[in-house]
């Protein structure tokens, strides 16, 4: 590696993947194994992230970039850069501190993560339940009871917008 020659800061010429080694007269030295520098002019290299246990390696560490982790199957990532791994549950369950627990009656979860949410209350939109809800699925709302009676108008007013799967508290 070339000896740096900057008049202002001799370290500014050290490229990514190296560090400015004060012990060697500010020569640009390569980052040691299991470390990296992602920008030039660094006086130290950063230790590579280790992906072990609940984490597994998505991208290996290089001299210029940190390792990237994801989660071992059975768990999913949380947080920026997959800073945590959280347990998966089955559909129809939610994660609690006691582990995965079935959704209570009247609630559902159609994913492996997240919380159980209340079934949609069809009657709030003036509709009837077409398909009953389960632990894994929301109810399906059908036409209002009035729409099903003979001679009723086939036009129904639009339902107010509401977040899917949530009933107003």
């Amino acid at each position: 590696f070339e000896r740096t020659r900057s008049l202002q800061d001799p370290c500014s010429n050290c490229p990514a993947g190296t560090f400015c080694d004060n012990n060697r007269n500010q020569i640009c030295s390569p980052c040691p194994p299991n470390s990296f520098s992602s920008a030039g002019g660094q006086r130290t290299c950063d230790i590579c992230r280790q992906c072990k246990g609940v984490f597994r390696t998505r991208k290996e560490c290089s001299s210029t970039s940190n390792a990237e982790c994801d989660c071992t199957p059975g768990f999913h990532c949380l947080g920026a850069g997959c800073s945590m791994c959280e347990q998966d549950c089955k559909q129809g369950q939610e994660l609690t501190k006691k582990g995965c627990k079935d959704c209570c009656f009247g609630t559902f979860n159609d994913q492996k993560r997240g919380i159980c949410r209340p079934w949609t209350n069809c009657s709030l939109d003036g509709k009837s339940v077409l398909v009953n809800g389960t632990k894994e699925r929301d109810v399906v709302c059908g036409p209002s009871p009035a729409d099903l009676s003979p001679g009723a108008s086939s036009v129904t007013p639009p339902a107010p917008a509401r977040e899917p799967g949530h009933s107003p508290q």
């Epitope: 246990g53 949380l78 947080g79 800073s83 945590m84 791994c85 959280e86 994660l95 609690t96 501190k97």
Partner: nanobody, 123 residues
Framework: EVQLVESGGGLVQPGGSLRLSCAAS?????NYWMNWVRQAPGKGLEW???????????YYVDSVKGRFTISRDNAKNSLYLQMSSLRAEDTAVYYC????????????????SGQGTTVTVSS
Amino acid sequence: EVQLVESGGGLVQPGGSLRLSCAASGFTLSNYWMNWVRQAPGKGLEWVANINQDGSERYYVDSVKGRFTISRDNAKNSLYLQMSSLRAEDTAVYYCARGGEGYGVDHYGLDVSGQGTTVTVSS
């Protein structure tokens, strides 16, 4: 550096017992929920048990209830898993893992885990 190191695994006969230990360093154990998780050969990762900061709350996956006991010694910065009445299906790599900041409130994410210790139950 934040680190967890598991030990105590080995080969044991069905019905036997084993005690796993996890030594924590680089952080104050008493500030965190702690967990044991395991990975059986060819299977996904499975949560086994957790314990709150002072040991007053402990929870287990159904398959180990009454057989496994999680405990901690904050003064020794150590976590334990006492396993008894072991079965072939308990064969796995066991990892100790720290509950991240906000565990049990905002999420149940684990942010640090060790390299694991292997438990083999076989006659």
